[in-house]
Interface confidence: medium
């Protein structure tokens, strides 16, 4: 694992994987299908979705002082999105195209989250609702929204790892 004893991650490895995640998230987004907006949703940002915010220690100074706060936040987000991508939202009808990058995206989220998980240490992960089979139009709308949100999340994570690789690597 990349965080032996919970010290610092393999920044370069994390940077490479996070950049791959960015590419996959952008390539997956247009492929989730046409959205049938038969029912409007709430358009506010929900508190249940992990965001990387100012107080999370992901700024250059925060990463220098103690990168664990930021890495824990990123880890929570990766697990959150990994669960969503593995849920009925993406596995149910309408089926994704056989060559869809969503499968790769799911695997890469899991891979990066494992790189960040310290040996023998388990960060608390956010509970997400039990994602019971939703109607096809709901799945399409959710796929669109989840991937859009994931793009923003991995873009910030990639910047964090790029900074770490450039300035914090041993």
């Amino acid at each position: 694992r990349a965080v032996p004893g919970g010290s610092s991650p393999a920044w370069t490895q994390c940077q490479q994987l996070s950049q791959k995640l960015c590419t996959l998230a952008w390539s997956a987004h247009p492929l989730v299908g046409h959205m049938d907006l038969r029912e409007e949703g709430d358009e506010e940002t929900t508190n249940d979705v992990p965001h990387i915010q100012c107080g999370d220690g992901c700024d250059p100074q925060g990463l220098r002082d103690n990168s664990q706060f930021c890495l824990q936040r990123i880890h929570q987000g990766l697990i959150f999105y990994e669960k969503l991508l593995g849920s009925d939202i993406f596995t149910g009808e309408p089926s994704l195209l056989p060559d869809s990058p969503v499968g790769q995206l799911h695997a890469s989220l899991l891979g990066l989250s494992q790189l960040l998980q310290p040996e023998g240490h388990h960060w608390e992960t956010q509970q997400i609702p039990s994602l019971s089979p939703s109607q096809p139009w709901q799945r399409l709308l959710l796929r669109f929204k989840i991937l859009r949100s994931l793009q923003a999340f991995v873009a910030v994570a990639a910047r964090v790892f790029a900074h770490g690789a450039a300035t914090l690597s041993p």
Epitope: D42, I128, P129, P133, Q135
Partner: antibody, heavy 127, light 108 residues
Amino acid sequence: EVQLLESGGGLVQPGGSLRLSCAASGFTFSKYTMQWVRQAPGKGLEWVSRISSSGGATRYADSVKGRFTISRDNSKNTLYLQMNSLRAEDTAVYYCARDLGQTIFGVVIGFGGMDVWGQGTTVTVSS
Amino acid sequence: DIQMTQSPSSLSASVGDRVTITCRASQSISSYLNWYQQKPGKAPKLLIYAASSLQSGVPSRFSGSGSGTDFTLTISSLQPEDFATYYCQQSYSTPPYTFGQGTKLEIK
């Protein structure tokens, strides 16, 4: 204890208005989609309206559309049903109920079962 | 709107009997089917959601099955407290969430 308590029912003349309230306790009200369901005397259950967790998405039965307005105040843990232009056929016991569905990314998902109900409040529309 | 038809509309049975109530949707509703029990003067109580999932706290003698258009609520061994009216409800197509007309279960 998870509880819903309706109030505001009563006798009203045709064409009149009433506002029903439903006070929630024992759970995080702001996370749940909520419903109103009614039952006319001696009749079955009729779904009336639904509101998403933040109040941003509402739905109505055709029979009340344009006359009833569902709303919520999450800071007060309270659900409302404003009923205008009341008709004799609106006479019923009105129940508020919590929806099993969850809102994620602004979309209500889940099965729409109602797992917690209030005791009901009676609305009588008569001249 | 999707119509829900329950049968029978009333039913007489004895304590210990196995009872089956059926619900048919006018079009496929996948597994979006819930069952409620209501006693006179009381609010409905959720028994089964998602066609076959037993709601927490509901006795295991209640079970649900079906998918698509045809659904069944079964009470394996009727108890005195089970005499009530039962409603099915679809939540596939909203609005509206439509209920069946109810099945009144009475003591024989």
